[in-house]
Interface confidence: low
């Protein structure tokens, strides 16, 4: 007879898997011993391998649910073309039977006691139910038995009382506008909304419960710009060290506008970021020396000659100066203390002279006295002899300038009865008073 041929046999379940097709003979299907076959769809699956016993099935349930019974299990000879041990043909079942006991004793029914009293009504107002109970103990059931029927029964009850109405909140109202236009100020901006206990209102007779919770709530406003923060001065910093090593100096303290830093357009700190103080080292400052003005030139002389006056003989003369005022390790005066030059002496020499042009007008004298006048002069100016202007004193030292020195005796023709000086005087006009400018300011 033709069979259904499968490519697999599942040992654990005994099922055929992977249908190859139908209408073939057992012999053709079992050319591959890994295959399996069924004589009809849903029928027993037999593997093509040589026959052997399947695994034992699980034990069937015990034949009774209480006291001692028995239970069966089986195995099957599965395979083709041969026999299982014991010369059993494929498809044959082998059985095992054993004693079993699910529960030692069998349940026995119990009996009810009488009904107990009715419990109070389930509600304190309007209509409800009331209940009474009985016990399963006349007699008590045995071995898991029970009493037939219900352990409690209920009936309607009426309290004859009107029920109170408890309050419930209506929906929240809208949020109020923000209490400020910016955040971060002394009062954080908030918006508030409220609701009414009116959905429904609590009854007064009998009194209903008020609504639970709050009638309003607040929250902070979001999306607002930050409030301007005015700057505040931090503490004064340390006093800077005295910048001088002697005498008086000036020290400084600084502070920063960061307590707080101005923010969001707030104003900067008012006032100064620095303040100064006088500091005193109590150490006198060094005073550098300063040259006095040069002294007079010494007479123009030449060593080993008694006089060179009125002669074309160069001499030498010197002048000195003093370094004054140096104190407290101040600098010494720079430069030479003595100055030497070459000279021709015209001291008391009679020289031909000529009258000079008028000098410029001098200052008004006396400046603060009565009737000040100014003067100008013409002088009898000597004509200096044409001596060489330079000399070479020592070989290799180059040319040295030679200067005329001394007060000659110039000789001019008389002018307005004068031989040396002609003077002209004029009064000064519109003379202002001498006043101390400091006193004038006061």
């Amino acid at each position: 007879d033709p069979v259904l041929c499968f490519t697999q046999y599942e040992e654990s379940s005994g099922k055929c898997k992977g249908l190859l097709g139908g209408g073939v003979s057992v012999e053709d299907c079992c050319l591959n011993t890994a295959f399996a076959y069924q004589k009809r769809s849903g029928g027993l699956c037999q593997p093509c391998r040589s026959p052997r016993w399947s695994l034992w099935s699980t034990w069937a349930p015990c034949s009774v649910t209480c006291s001692e019974g028995s239970q069966l299990r089986y195995r099957r000879c599965v395979g083709w073309n041969g026999q299982c041990s014991g010369k059993v043909a494929p498809g044959t079942l082998e059985w095992q039977l054993q004693a079993c006991e699910d529960q030692q004793c069998c349940p026995e029914m119990g009996g009810w006691s009488g009904w107990g009293p009715w419990e109070p009504c389930s509600v304190t107002c309007s209509k409800g139910t009331r209940t009474r109970r009985r016990a399963c103990n006349h007699p008590a059931p045995k071995c898991g038995g029970h009493c037939p029927g219900q352990a409690q029964e209920s009936e309607a009850c009426d309290t004859q009382q009107v029920c109170p109405t408890h309050g419930a909140w209506a929906t929240w109202g809208p949020w109020t506008p923000c209490s400020a236009s910016c955040h971060g100020g002394p009062h954080e901006p908030k918006e508030t909304r409220s609701r009414k206990c009116s959905a429904p209102e609590p009854s007064q007779k009998p009194p209903g419960k008020p609504c639970p919770g709050l009638a309003y709530e607040q929250r902070r406003c979001t999306g607002l710009p930050p409030c301007p923060v005015a700057g505040g001065w931090g503490p004064w910093g340390p006093v800077s060290p005295c910048p001088v090593t002697c005498g008086l100096g000036q020290t400084m303290e600084q502070r920063t506008c960061n307590h707080p830093v101005p923010q969001h357009g707030g104003p900067f700190c008012a006032g100064d970021a620095t303040r100064t103080h006088i500091c005193n080292t109590a150490v006198p400052c060094p005073v550098d020396g300063e040259w006095d003005s040069w002294g007079e030139w010494s007479p123009c002389i030449r060593r080993n000659m008694k006089s060179i006056s009125c002669q074309e003989i160069p001499g030498q003369q010197s002048r000195g100066r003093t370094c004054r005022g140096r104190k407290f390790d101040g600098h010494r005066c720079a430069g030479q203390q003595q100055d030497i030059r070459h000279c021709y002496s015209i001291q008391h020499c009679p020289l031909k002279g000529s009258w000079s042009e008028w000098s410029t007008w001098g200052l008004c004298m006396p400046p603060c006295g009565p009737n000040p006048t100014r003067a100008r002069q013409r002088l009898c100016t000597p004509l200096l002899p044409k001596y060489p202007p330079t000399v070479s004193m020592v070989e290799g030292q180059g040319e040295k300038n030679v200067t005329f020195w001394g007060r000659p005796l110039p000789r001019c023709e008389e002018l307005q009865g004068q031989k040396l000086v002609v003077e002209e005087k004029r009064p000064c006009l519109h003379v202002p008073a001498c006043k101390d400018p400091e006193e004038e300011e006061l």
């Epitope: 955040h183 971060g184 002394p186 009062h187 954080e188 908030k190 919770g213 709050l214 709530e217 607040q218 929250r219 902070r220």
Partner: nanobody
Amino acid sequence: EVQLVESGGGLVQPGGSLRLSCAASGRISSIIHMAWVRQAPGKQRELVSEISRVGTTVYADSVKGRFTISRDNSKNTLYLQMNSLRAEDTAVYYCNALQYEKHGGADYWGQGTLVTVSS
């Protein structure tokens, strides 16, 4: 003074979850509102969610249904459970507390915790 310390940020893949915590200390009895605020790179701070003292919650439209704010008063801690995270949730998340007393209010901020959503 109120001190706020955030934790729980990190790197997570799109669709993943994170739970941020904010531990509050100091004068916490006068806190009336707490909030989570985030700031993405180059953008302004944006309110994510807030919770009032009585438990009222508010969420930004962009996080509704994905984020849950809660607070544990016994631990003085604020939480933000973030589910179904998206790349646009990448930001520094700040914990914010609003303190209000008779003499005035103050805004307190944590140092922030970075949340990065990236595959």
